[in-house]
């Protein structure tokens, strides 16, 4: 439906509060280095303009597209070239190229200071002094650090952030109330950002078809009672929502997401029996709840898949008539029967089925050619099952920290060219699969583990894309979205790698390590471990373990010493010498 003024349409649909919040998120995701105050000023100007268009849709410039309006506004920033360099060249382009240019300059790892959490009294004071500014600042800080964060979901996080402060700043023990809530929001926020980053990568690097395939599989698992036509409609709508958000069209995205939630709730009887509670909630909670809703029960007595997809004489006819529809039906039918499979496995099976049909439908006897296609699935299913079994056993044996260390060593040997901070971050996240998924029963392990690993490996891919250093990473990241994890799993030690020169400074530690949190201390030790492997890629597990045990003892000893700094200096030299000897450096 065409509107005279798109900006007026979205302002009226979303309301002023959400409109302003979404414009702020959009601007902060594009211009990640701009100060908060500058963004607020731009947002206020856009909002005032939108109000004039609501009053009179025929007013000057009200007919312009949102990209034109927002792009023009962003291009008024005075320090664009000094701050962003070549991104300023985007402003010389016309829409839609200008917006594409801004999108290409989004930085997944912006050079921004770590967010330091102030004292609780200071945070509560800031919250009470100006609640609106405090919450805007939250949106701004998250959006600029996570330029692909799912904007309507960020509104939900902000609502929970506000609730945490409203409750805890009037609590007796404010810190005990607030800090766990903020930790939870931080951890959930990072996970949400990473999940959305994979959706955007899927759309942008592999296209709409890849995303739709993912959505068919996931929604069919979640809504196994829904008809194929219903799932297809949901997939189409969901693809539109995510295409918009990943493309920076946040107002349209939020509006369409609200419409989709409304549609799902109005039609829950034909979608899922699990939606009732979600649909009683307010909009932001409702949309979040639907996105996280548990899988519905599978319909009883589903017929065998073989009848329609192997045994039928019409397989090639049906495939030829509408390839994607037929493959979509295959994926739907397979996924609704297999909530125990990861989405990426289901997509691998569908790809195998497609490849077989492409080959066999051109053969002399198609039916005889594809008759055993389901047998080809067996090794594809067993590979992730075995991998998860082995890694969960290792996790249970080692615990999370040591399991992360095992993965650090494994991945550093596979791709030693990758920067140490990236290897540490990615391996730590890979290691979290243990505590996240290994506690689940067999039927839930694979969807939990492999789909989580897809999200984490995508972090590696987007960080590596910014500064490519390894052909092996590039290959695994770009060849096939669904085979990324098997591709990385299959990598062996990189024999072409020339070990890094030894630098004593890398292994010099100071008393400040003693005041770090347990998590930060682990990161320091894991950083040292990666560096060790980069120096000595052929070091055995036993050698590395011995050095790391000595290192842990050294830190513990010096942190107990009266003169910590002297201890770190003197004992540190001894440790470096001993480690070099142990590793034969």
């Amino acid at each position: 439906d065409a509107h005279k003024s798109e900006v007026a349409h979205r302002f009226k649909d979303l309301g002023e509060e959400n409109f302003k919040a979404l414009v702020l998120i959009a601007f902060a995701q594009y211009l990640q280095q701009c100060p908060f105050e500058d963004h607020v000023k731009l947002v206020n100007e856009v909002t005032e303009f939108a109000k004039t268009c609501v009053a009179d849709e025929s007013a000057e410039n009200c007919d312009k597209s949102l990209h034109t309006l927002f792009g023009d506004k962003l291009c008024t920033v005075a320090t664009l070239r000094e701050t962003y360099g070549e991104m300023a060249d985007c402003c010389a382009k016309q829409e839609p190229e200008r917006n594409e240019c801004f999108l290409q300059h989004k930085d997944d790892n912006p050079n921004l200071p770590r967010l330091v959490r102030p004292e609780v009294d200071v945070m509560c004071t800031a919250f009470h002094d100006n609640e609106e500014t405090f919450l805007k600042k939250y949106l701004y800080e998250i959006a600029r650090r996570h330029p692909y964060f799912y904007a309507p979901e960020l509104l939900f996080f902000a609502k929970r952030y506000k609730a945490a402060f409203t409750e805890c700043c009037q609590a007796a023990d404010k810190a005990a109330c607030l800090l766990p809530k903020l930790d939870e929001l931080r951890d959930e926020g990072k996970a949400s950002s990473a999940k959305q980053r994979l959706k955007c990568a899927s759309l942008q690097k592999f296209g709409e078809r890849a995303f739709k395939a993912w959505a068919v599989a996931r929604l069919s698992q979640r809504f196994p009672k829904a008809e194929f036509a219903e799932v297809s409609k949901l997939v189409t709508d969901l693809t539109k929502v995510h295409t918009e958000c990943c493309h920076g069209d946040l107002l349209e995205c939020a509006d369409d997401r609200a419409d989709l939630a409304k549609y799902i709730c109005e039609n829950q009887d034909s979608i899922s029996s699990k939606l009732k509670e979600c649909c009683e909630k307010p909009l932001l909670e409702k949309s979040h709840c639907i996105a996280e809703v548990e899988n519905d029960e599978m319909p009883a007595d589903l017929p065998s898949l073989a009848a329609d997809f192997v045994e039928s004489k019409d397989v090639c006819k049906n495939y030829a008539e509408a390839k994607d529809v037929f493959l979509g039906m295959f994926l739907y039918e397979y996924a609704r029967r297999h909530p125990d499979y990861s989405v990426v496995l289901l997509l691998r099976l569908a790809k195998t089925y497609e490849t077989t049909l492409e080959k066999c439908c051109a053969a002399a006897d198609p039916h005889e050619c594809y008759a055993k296609v389901f047998d080809e699935f067996k090794p594809l299913v067993e590979e992730p099952q075995n991998l998860i079994k082995q890694n969960c056993e290792l996790f249970e044996q080692l615990g999370e920290y040591k399991f992360q260390n095992a993965l650090l060593v494994r991945y550093t040997k596979k791709v030693p060219q990758v920067s140490t901070p990236t290897l540490v971050e990615v391996s730590r996240n890979l290691g979290k699969v243990g505590s996240k998924c290994c506690k689940h029963p067999e039927a839930k392990r694979m969807p939990c583990a492999e789909d989580y690993l897809s999200v984490v490996l995508n972090q590696l891919c987007v960080l590596h894309e910014k500064t490519p250093v390894s052909d092996r990473v590039t290959k695994c990241c770009t060849e096939s979205l669904v085979n990324r994890r098997p591709c990385f799993s299959a990598l062996e030690v990189d024999e072409t790698y020339v070990p890094k020169e030894f630098n004593a400074e890398t292994f010099t530690f100071h008393a400040d390590i003693c005041t770090l949190s347990e998590k930060e201390r682990q990161i320091k030790k894991q950083t040292a471990l990666v560096e060790l492997v980069k120096h000595k890629p052929k070091a055995t597990k036993e050698q590395l373990k011995a050095v790391m045990d000595d290192f842990a003892a050294f830190v513990e000893k010096c942190c107990k010493a009266d003169d910590k700094e002297t201890c770190f200096a003197e004992e540190g030299k001894k440790l470096v010498a001993a480690s070099q000897a142990a590793l034969g450096l």
Partner: antibody, heavy 124, light 107 residues
């Protein structure tokens, strides 16, 4: 302006219960906690407990644990304090008071607005 | 529980006098101390929060100081309307506690 309006005086027999109400106006009710403080005739101030108006969570002084219940009705911006098993030494003026916001970097939980007080007399 | 001891329990002073009331905590309470004024038959009124911050609308002749365990409330020049009972209150830990009060009367 910010106001806390309490219910009227009560006379109760020992062993009975009393429920005092405190209606807030002039501010966002769920943004501020409410404390209850009592004052026996000619005596000092004694803290009874506190309610988080946002979550409904409560904290009571040990002395009143098991006898006091604080609740709130956000739809009418009202807090209630019910004290059961009344004894003669529960005779006092009961005040509700608003916990002030954190200001200038400190959450002093000062009681910045007080109700007018409700006299509860326990007598056989 | 944390005990607050006010001194003196009562004092007599004249209009224009400088008056100091002290409040000692049985353990450190940082700056989580507030001062109230109460007149007969009325509810208490907040004067000072966070040990030294003047509540808005309170005359500047009132001031507070201290941290840890020792705190003072000072009235620089007594006015007729200042004759009342003064209470300190700590909010560092639950249960919240009040001092026993200091009665300030006209000499």
């Amino acid at each position: 302006q910010v106001q806390l309006l309490q219910s009227g005086a009560e006379v109760k027999k020992p062993g009975a219960s009393v429920k005092v109400s405190c209606k807030a106006s002039g501010y966002t009710f769920t943004s501020y906690g409410i404390s209850w403080v009592r004052q026996a005739p000619g005596q000092g101030l004694e803290w009874v407990g506190w309610i988080n108006t946002y979550s409904g969570g409560t904290k009571y002084a040990q002395k009143f644990q098991g006898r006091v219940t604080m609740t709130r009705d956000t739809s009418i911006s009202t807090v209630y304090m019910e004290l059961s098993g009344l004894k003669s030494d529960d005779t006092a003026v009961y005040y509700c008071a608003r916990l002030g916001h954190c200001q200038r970097g400190i959450c002093s939980d000062a009681l910045d607005t007080w109700g007018q007080g409700t006299l509860v007399t326990v007598s056989s | 529980e944390l005990v607050l001891t006010q001194s003196p329990s009562s004092l007599s002073a004249s209009v224009g006098d400088r008056v100091t009331i002290t409040c000692r905590a049985s353990q450190s309470i940082s700056r989580y101390l507030n001062w109230y004024q109460q007149k007969p038959g009325k509810a208490p009124k907040l004067l000072i929060y966070g040990a030294s911050r003047l509540e808005s609308g309170v005359p500047s002749r009132f001031s507070g100081s201290g941290s840890g365990t020792d705190f003072t409330l000072t009235i620089s020049s007594l006015q007729p309307e200042d004759f009342a009972t003064y209470y300190c209150q700590q909010s560092d830990s639950v249960p919240v506690t009040f001092g026993q009060g200091t009665r300030l009367e006209i000499k």
